[in-house]
Amino acid sequence: APTSSSTKKTQLQLEHLLLDLQMILNGINNYKNPKLTRMLTFKFYMPKKATELKHLQCLEEELKPLEEVLNLAQSKNFHLRPRDLISNINVIVLELKGSETTFMCEYADETATIVEFLNRWITFCQSIISTLT
């Protein structure tokens, strides 16, 4: 059974994941982002079901494409480069989903834009956090 300290750690990790996903979304949605139109042409796979931590496998599998789209910004002036954000997200996702069991991700038939994709995973984090508090 999960202890209160492990639940607290999971909650903190989910909060950090949520914050970085929101930061990416904010950067994309920024009205000054000249590459937004092009970014929206890229399609992302959405999970058929995302209700448990093991479903983060579906996010992990899309992190490389996410980084590639973020690199379109081609700014020489990053506080944080896309790879910094994606690397941190990857570490958190690996810790949250665990590596004991191998879960085969099932994707929905419809693909999504980067904005829809990020919003889906933001909602996932918020949902899981709400069950822990």
Epitope: L19, Q22, S87
Partner: nanobody, 119 residues
């Protein structure tokens, strides 16, 4: 409006350590990047290290393995632990606050704190 107050600068010998702090107050947005930049005499301002509210970090190559950035989201404070300091680390260190990960959209800068590494 966000206010940034830096502290911890000073004079230190080569090989020594310092810990800088930057406390943000005012209209703080929970999703942000806080970081440290520095400007040596006659040079441009350069990134030292930055950290997101989610814990993503970025370091300048020249400080990797020597400097560590961390933050306390509850206190809206960012820290820079500087070890194995070198004379070339001498500069004014500025705290930065941004709601985006793009540097050219930095919202606020601190006043700066002087770090001098000299024997």
């Amino acid at each position: 409006e966000v206010q940034l107050v830096e502290s911890g600068g000073g004079l230190v010998q080569p090989g020594g350590s310092l810990r800088l702090s930057c406390a943000a107050s005012g209209s703080i947005f929970s999703i942000n990047v806080m970081g440290w930049y520095r400007q040596a005499p006659g040079k441009g301002r350069e990134l030292v290290a930055a950290i997101s509210s989610g814990g993503s970090t970025n370091y300048a190559d020249s400080v990797k393995g020597r400097f560590t950035i961390s933050r306390d989201n509850a206190k809206n404070t960012v820290y820079l632990q500087m070890n194995s300091l070198k004379p070339e680390d001498t500069a004014v260190y500025y705290c930065a606050y941004a709601s985006s990960f793009y540097e050219d959209e930095t919202d606020y800068w601190g006043q700066g704190t002087q770090v001098t590494v000299s024997s």
